[in-house]
């Protein structure tokens, strides 16, 4: 079957590399400086993406694989691929269309991106305030006020390891 | 391949509560918000409220407070809304829906939908 | 509470440019996002962040927004971008959507 197809299309025996050059009767040509295809068959080569600006290199091209960018200090990527940088803000702030603003009392902000977003209002859960919220920390809701009894004491969770917006990308 | 599956389809009767299921796979729960949003018959779309899957924090739209309870459990990677005393109006598809990277509000991954009918 | 307000119908024949706008007060200092929904199915992100477009959606969607007045945009219009369109908001702790537009295909 392999040996049918490859006399229908001598073009599917090129590698991931090279290309099916039209103009050479279609011998694979490896793909000229700057360009790659990263499966084979391919009848053209497709551009580089160049990381600049903002933009910095995180893989850098190969024969067979786009060039990976991220984003220079400061700056986060977002879209598919790191499509965009967006400025950092500090936490206990929020990027708005005119820069970086401070959270409003009641509401925080624990990343360097995204919204300030309102405290957690632990009594709607049916439980109670164990550690004050602030610009850049939820509060941390504990048990309802109904299991505080006296002389009872209630420990503070471990900050967590990783939240929303830290995963890898 | 990242999915967002939720539980099935329930009837309930007027007064009671229901709980919806929304099961993630594919990306790290913890990591993005989620949200629930539901849909009434041939209405339009209606935010109830937030989970932060890494403090279990949560955020819910003034109309269902004191009503609705956004939950999740890590260790299954799923996120639970359950609405009380249901009345008929509450009839409608519930989606949950995943809060995308930028952490702006933009929903870039919704469940298939779970339909609640409360009828007597 | 703030209000979005969408035309509830916008027909355009297949080839032309549809605009489907969302209005609001002093919508351009906000962020808006933007879905479709088809018939029976959840609704998908076309346009986040006033104008950017997550991978998957063609380029045939943008968007605008500044003022009063965010806009959806779709040019060369198919028969498969009939749908309901919604916009989207955040505005003082809650998440608020357009009542949606219904985009017909003629």
């Known amino acids: 079957f392999e040996r049918t197809r490859s006399l229908q299309d001598p073009c599917s025996n090129c590698p991931a590399g090279t290309f099916c050059d039209n103009n050479r009767n279609q011998i694979c040509s490896p793909c000229p400086p700057n360009s790659f295809s990263s499966a084979g068959g391919q009848r053209t080569c497709d551009i580089c993406r160049q990381c600049k600006g903002v933009f910095r290199t995180r893989k850098e091209c190969s024969s067979t694989s786009n060039a990976e960018c991220d984003c220079t200090p400061g700056f986060h990527c977002l879209g598919a691929g790191c499509s965009m940088c967006e400025q950092d803000c500090k936490q206990g702030q929020e990027l708005t269309k005119k820069g970086c603003k401070d959270c409003c009392f009641g509401t925080f902000n624990d990343q360097k991106r995204g919204i300030c977003r309102p405290w957690t209002n632990c009594s709607l859960d049916g439980k109670s305030v164990l550690v004050n919220g602030t610009k850049e920390r939820d509060v941390v809701c504990g048990p309802s006020p109904a299991d505080l009894s006296p002389g009872a004491s209630s420990v503070t969770p471990p900050a967590p390891a990783r939240e929303p917006g830290h995963s890898p990308q | 391949q990242m999915q967002l599956v939720q539980s099935g389809a329930e009837v309930k009767k007027p007064g009671a509560s229901v709980k919806v299921s929304c099961k993630a796979s594919?990306?790290?729960?913890?990591?993005?918000?989620m949200h629930w949003v539901r849909q009434a018959p041939g209405q339009g779309l209606e935010w109830m409220g937030w989970?932060?899957?890494?403090?279990?924090?949560?955020n819910y739209a003034q109309k269902f407070q004191g009503r609705v309870t956004i939950t999740r459990d890590t260790s299954a990677s799923t996120a639970y809304m359950e609405l009380s005393s249901l009345r008929s109006e509450d009839t409608a598809v519930y989606y949950c829906a995943r809060e995308g990277m930028a952490m702006r509000l933009e929903l870039d991954k919704w469940g298939q939908g779970t339909l609640v009918t409360v009828s007597s | 509470s703030y209000e979005l307000t969408q035309p509830p119908s916008v027909s355009v024949a297949p080839g032309k440019t549809a605009r489907i706008t969302c209005g609001g007060n002093?919508?351009?200092?906000?962020?808006v996002h933007w879905y479709q929904q088809k018939p029976g199915q959840a609704p998908v992100l076309v346009i986040y962040y006033d104008s950017d477009r997550p991978s998957g959606i063609p380029e045939r969607f943008s968007g605008s927004n500044s003022g009063n007045t965010a806009t959806l945009t779709i040019s060369r219009v198919e028969a498969g971008d009939e749908a309901d369109y919604y916009c989207?908001?955040?505005?003082?702790?809650?998440?608020?959507f357009g009542g949606g537009t219904q985009l017909t295909v003629l």
């Open positions: 989207q908001v955040w505005d003082s702790s809650s998440v608020v």
């Open positions: 989970v932060n899957p890494m403090s279990g924090g949560t």
């Open positions: 594919g990306y790290s729960f913890s990591g993005y918000y």
């Open positions: 002093n919508i351009g200092s906000k962020s």
